[in-house]
Amino acid sequence: QRFAQAQQQLPLESLGWDVAELQLNHTGPQQDPRLYWQGGPALGRSFLHGPELDKGQLRIHRDGIYMVHIQVTLAICSSTTASRHHPTTLAVGICSPASRSISLLRLSFHQGCTIASQRLTPLARGDTLCTNLTGTLLPSRNTDETFFGVQWVRP
Amino acid sequence: QRFAQAQQQLPLESLGWDVAELQLNHTGPQQDPRLYWQGGPALGRSFLHGPELDKGQLRIHRDGIYMVHIQVTLAICSSTTASRHHPTTLAVGICSPASRSISLLRLSFHQGCTIASQRLTPLARGDTLCTNLTGTLLPSRNTDETFFGVQWVRP
Amino acid sequence: QRFAQAQQQLPLESLGWDVAELQLNHTGPQQDPRLYWQGGPALGRSFLHGPELDKGQLRIHRDGIYMVHIQVTLAICSSTTASRHHPTTLAVGICSPASRSISLLRLSFHQGCTIASQRLTPLARGDTLCTNLTGTLLPSRNTDETFFGVQWVRP
């Protein structure tokens, strides 16, 4: 009984349950392959509990192992379109601090119009994740077609 | 030592570890695009710990943020078959209560025969999740090819 | 306060937070369709906390429900290559003990060059997971393109 009470009294943050799910805000200017994200209940079903957005990029606030997941769907796309505009590639990586820059997850669309994947990776407080979309097809902004999120799993 | 004992005595449900993994039971009648799911140890490796099935649809029993994941493979399918049939799309959404109806996750097969994705989303007690498959190709009932599940992540 | 202290003193292992993320080491000899994995901080961002590697295959150390995820990208691949070398299939399963042998997750590449999926499944201490790649195309060893992992979710 005492444990249950204590558990309820502890702030969730102290349990390390950092989590975020983001929706696409906009693409970058011409020479910037990054996707810019947004999140918050006012926008729909996106949210940030722990991590923060820094100019549309996701910044981690707690060290740990995270499950990172993403889905990106190309707008006005068919397998014909996709193959004619090949190659379109999505890469998720740590883009800052520069000393920790690395690609975590990379997928090409080939003849498809959607990519979706997930992976476990260690992230540190201050790591900023960037999602780079190369190619000439625009990503869909529909919230059920394009989204990006992280979930703290363990220290 | 005392904490470890207390932890073992607490029912898992009180920790909020609701989780379910379902296998395909059958498709709906002519005008019903929903997939009907089943779960339980007698059926193989599917299970429900917390959520319940209501006429083949998954009903949530605990408020929180959930990781929802799905894989659907089309039966007797090749990239040629897939391209020669009406676009096949899968959508996962809250279908009841009607006031909370929304599409959470949507994917098209294009020239592929399998879609797989996952996302984090807030769900509330009583939310029923439906998986709508539009198109004219039958989904595989093999348990390693088609499955649908949710995992409670945090309040 | 007492609970917070106790929580910090408890080893993570006692909370059941077993987790692993692996990178591809090599493919098997001619008649062996298995992929051989490796993990550890010295190799990059792969790691094993709880599970172990047994001759390149992942062995589970704690009973429970796990989230299993995988991404495999074929090397030097285009949709044309993929369709000419079809069928290439990836299956993740329990390969030992033999009494528990079962396919958990299966995907074909069709005209694509990457597959990615995830599922929840019960696993028991001693279960060894194998990932079988059939086909004539080589998997990429890039750590952001090919990876395999498990995450303990609940008892």
Partner: antibody
């Protein structure tokens, strides 16, 4: 209500071609593949091929591959089956058919078109 | 091509009695959790009518005296209590792969 209405009976000479039409109504024409099945007098059923009206992409039974062409006109929701180099054994009732939800079995059939090949 | 063999070629059954028609495929038509076998009824001068799909699913509007069973290569259509309006030729068809093929048909008559 789904309906498939076929063109009328035809009499053709050996070596000629015949083009049978099938007009679909009661559903979204571009959604469902339309199949052609033939039945010689007093004989069984034989699948000839199908067409996906969304793109016009067709698949044919190898037996007829060199002689059959399936096309569609989305503006009139009509599909056509043309069989060339006719011979007497092509005398049959030709049916168009489609399905109700998933492809592979045929819930809706046209009334049939009798094609007689005779010199 | 998968060859479908129906038996018997013809069958005479008394009204109210059970009629059983068999269909054997030259190789398995079961995969992905389904058996891709379907049954049709055809009366003279009419197109075939779908009775059973995927081995054991009754098509909407079809009387429940019709049932299907089987898996792999061997399948059965059963009419539990034959009625006068059931006099017809019955065909099996597979859709496991292209080309789809039909059985040769079984003629059901009243004894």
């Amino acid at each position: 209500e789904v309906q498939m209405v076929q063109s009328g009976a035809e009499v053709k000479k050996p070596g000629a071609s015949v083009k049978v039409s099938c007009k679909a109504s009661g559903y979204t024409f571009t959604t469902y593949n339309i199949h052609w099945v033939r039945q010689a007098p007093g004989q069984g059923l034989e699948w000839m091929g199908d067409i996906y009206p969304g793109t016009g992409d067709a698949s044919y039974n190898q037996k007829f591959r060199d002689r059959v062409t399936m096309t569609r006109d989305t503006s009139t929701s009509t599909v056509y089956m043309e069989l060339s180099s006719l011979r007497s054994e092509d005398t049959a009732v030709y049916y168009c058919a489609t399905f109700s939800r998933f492809d592979g079995w045929f819930a809706y059939w046209g009334q049939g078109t009798l094609v007689t090949v005779s010199s | 091509d998968i060859v479908m063999t129906q038996s018997p070629d013809s069958l005479a059954v008394s009204l109210g009695e059970r009629a059983t028609i068999n269909c054997r495929a030259s190789r398995s038509v079961s995969t992905s959790g389904y058996s891709y076998m379907h049954w049709y009824q055809q009366k003279p001068g009419q197109p075939p009518k779908l009775l059973i799909y995927l081995a054991d699913n009754l098509e909407s509007g079809v009387p429940d005296r019709f049932s299907g069973s089987g898996s792999g290569t061997d399948f059965t259509l059963t009419i539990s209590s034959l009625q006068a309006e059931d006099v017809a030729v019955y065909y099996c068809q597979h859709s496991r792969e292209l080309p789809y093929t039909f059985g040769g048909g079984t003629k059901v008559e009243i004894k």
